[in-house]
């Protein structure tokens, strides 16, 4: 059986392709060459006489071809445009006929693509997005790449045009890139140069740091407003609702009790038109923006009921503080027999009675912070001798 | 199956002119030459004239030249004689034959099929 | 151009051998080693025997094979049989302006 295979059978453009012959009979006057799937003497490319060992050029020669005393033809510089079948035509030394077909395909040397986008500068969760990889070429396919990734799986993104477009649907800041675009074909592979997208959004709700939230007089007050936003956002401070300056950071130096207020960042980006606005309060006082955990100490943490008496102590360093005593989430005193000395910081109960046994602690506080204890257990018992084991802490 | 088949053939008197017709099927037209031979009664084979596969070239025998003409209709498979000045000495049986030249060039085939042929009579 | 010189008649009993010759010049014969021979029986078309010199078409019989030698070129039928009786016309390739010439024909008689 005649047959006829392709050398390489994709063929890149330019190089060249051997259409070689398989079990050509052995006795022969000659064999042709056809454009197409079938014997067209308008469509010849070349005929070998076995006779003369000469070919003779047919309609179809592009001089580009050879043909070998083995039947086989090269094709050399190839073009699209020989893409197809080819026949070849054995005449037998008996004229009898006997035809193959084969086939062969050729692809471009791909250019290196390029993305085009129909908006470079979306803002985000509103705009759609689509690119494009140019150039549009036959036979090729379109892959593409986010983060040097393969596509992610995902609603918001959508491929059309045979793969050539690809949509991001209402953007977001994460999608800024870089996008690259790959186009591929049997013999060629080339890849773009990456592009970033430039997302509009924001301002975010601002941000302004330090935390603080309490200032000693004279100190100095610095405060800075950060939102996300692009393009950058435009920075305003406000006091007590009255405009001060049109900058990202506010200074006043050497604050008073004055200075206390409330404080508005205002940020706004011109580009999506949008504002956003964080407000601080700031209290500038003497007194410690944060009370110390005060330590609480009894005289005997296990008395006798009805006997004994017990002094509780609430101890603390800060200055300009108010204490309170609590016993089962009760305020104390709660009777004649408790009573509070030294400011408050000693609780004296006399005698113990039972319902007495428990757990207390104290709180200290001024009118900007407290702080509780931990909590102490007061064990009563009756007809017992009394244990001196000091502190116990519940 | 390769068949030839003559036609146009007849009774024509000196000076007149008849063309004849060959419908070829069962092979590749287009691919081979076409020829005509002719036959007087009694008389050998003389070879007439024959066309290229393309129809681009054309060849005649010394003593038709000027008077025949051979033509081909690729797309209907059809050869065509043209006879014109006709003389007492064409009275012949005319055969197509298959072959005479392959392809485009001019290498020499053989003929290796004919058609049945078709009588022409020049007589007043 | 002249027709090729071929013997008018061949005879030979069946099973015999039988050689018929074609001369030509060294413009035809000699000078292509394109000769045909062709068989052709009473009221019938000619048929391909024979083609460039040696070579065989298929469906025509072993019994028949061909030769040349300078000017002359020779068909020979072994093994004569009955249905090999007709005329035989020989032709070669002269140019490539007057591309053929027959030979003057040889009848063969199977005796």
């Known amino acids: 059986q005649l047959t006829t295979e392709s050398m390489p059978f994709n063929v890149a453009e330019g190089k060249e392709v051997l259409l070689l012959v398989h079990n050509l009979p052995q006795q022969l006057f000659g064999y042709s060459w056809y454009k197409g799937e079938r014997v067209d003497g308008n469509r010849q490319i070349v005929g070998y006489a076995i006779g003369t060992q000469q070919a003779t050029p047919g309609p179809a020669n592009s001089g580009r071809e050879t043909i070998y005393p083995n039947a086989s033809l090269l094709i050399q510089n190839v073009t699209q445009n020989d893409t197809g079948f080819y026949t070849l035509q054995v005449i037998k030394s008996d004229l009898v006929n006997e035809e193959a077909t084969g086939q062969f395909h050729v692809y471009p040397e791909l250019p290196k693509p390029s993305i085009s986008s129909n908006n470079s500068n979306p803002v985000e969760d509103k705009d759609a997005v689509a690119f494009t990889c140019e150039p549009e070429t036959q036979d090729t396919t379109y892959l593409w790449w986010i983060n040097n990734q393969s596509l992610p799986v995902s609603p918001r993104l959508q491929l059309s045009n045979g793969n050539r477009t690809l949509t991001l649907l209402s953007v977001t800041r994460n999608d800024t890139g870089p996008y690259e675009c790959e186009i591929q074909n049997p013999v060629s592979a080339n890849r773009s140069d990456p592009v970033t997208l430039n997302v509009t959004y924001g301002p975010d709700t601002p941000t302004i740091s330090p935390s603080d939230t309490y200032y000693r007089p004279g100190a100095n007050l610095s405060l800075s407003c950060y939102a996300a936003s692009n393009p950058p956002a435009q920075y305003s401070w406000l006091i007590n609702g009255t405009f001060q300056q049109s900058t990202q950071e506010l200074f006043i130096p050497n604050i008073t009790v004055n200075n206390s207020g409330s404080y508005t960042c205002h940020a706004n980006n011109s580009v999506t038109g949008c504002n956003r606005t964080t407000v601080k309060t700031i209290i500038v006082t003497e007194l410690s923006p944060v009370v110390a955990k005060p330590q609480i100490k009894a005289s005997k943490t296990t008395v006798t009921g009805d006997k004994d008496s017990v002094n509780l102590t609430c101890s603390t360093n800060d200055t300009g503080i108010s204490i309170r005593w609590f016993f089962k989430n009760q305020s104390l005193p709660s009777s004649e027999r408790m009573k509070l000395s030294q400011g408050n910081t000693t609780l004296s109960i006399n005698p113990v009675k039972r319902e007495d046994a428990g757990t207390y602690w104290c709180e200290v506080f001024n009118p900007i912070s407290k702080n509780q204890s931990d909590p102490i257990m007061l064990n009563v018992n009756y007809n017992a001798l009394p244990q001196e084991n000091g502190l116990s802490p519940g | 199956e390769v068949q030839l088949l003559e036609s146009g053939g007849g009774l024509v008197q000196p000076g007149g002119s008849l063309r004849l017709s060959c419908a070829a099927s069962?092979?590749?037209?287009?691919?081979?030459?076409m020829s005509w031979a002719r036959q007087a009664p009694g008389k050998g084979l003389e070879w007439v004239s024959t066309?290229?596969?393309?129809?681009?070239?054309?060849y005649y025998a010394d003593s038709v030249k000027g008077r025949f003409t051979i033509s081909r209709d690729n797309s209907k498979n059809t050869l065509y004689l043209q006879i014109n000045s006709l003389r007492a000495e064409d009275t012949a049986v005319y055969y197509c034959?298959?072959?005479?030249?392959?392809?485009?060039?001019?290498?020499?085939?053989?003929?290796?099929?004919w058609g049945q042929g078709t009588l022409v009579t020049v007589s007043s | 151009q002249s027709a090729l010189t071929q013997p008018a008649s061949v005879s030979g009993s069946p099973g015999q051998s039988i050689t018929i010759s074609c001369t030509g010049t060294?413009?035809?014969?000699?000078?292509?080693?394109?000769v045909s021979w062709y068989q052709q029986h009473p009221g019938k078309a000619p048929k391909l025997m024979i083609y460039?010199?040696?070579n065989r078409p298929s469906g025509v019989s072993n019994r028949f094979s061909g030769s040349k030698s300078d000017n002359t070129a020779s068909l020979t039928i072994s093994g004569l049989q009955a249905e090999d009786e007709a005329d035989y016309y020989c032709?070669?390739?002269?140019?490539?302006?007057?591309?053929?010439?027959f030979g003057i024909g040889t009848k063969v008689t199977v005796l």
């Open positions: 034959a298959k072959g005479g030249l392959l392809w485009f060039g001019e290498l020499p085939y053989p003929f290796d099929y």
């Open positions: 069962g092979f590749t037209f287009n691919t081979y030459g």
């Open positions: 066309i290229s596969g393309s129809g681009d070239n054309t």
């Open positions: 060294s413009s035809d014969v000699g000078g292509y080693n394109y």
């Open positions: 460039d010199v040696s």
């Open positions: 032709s070669s390739y002269i140019s490539t302006s007057t591309l053929y010439v």
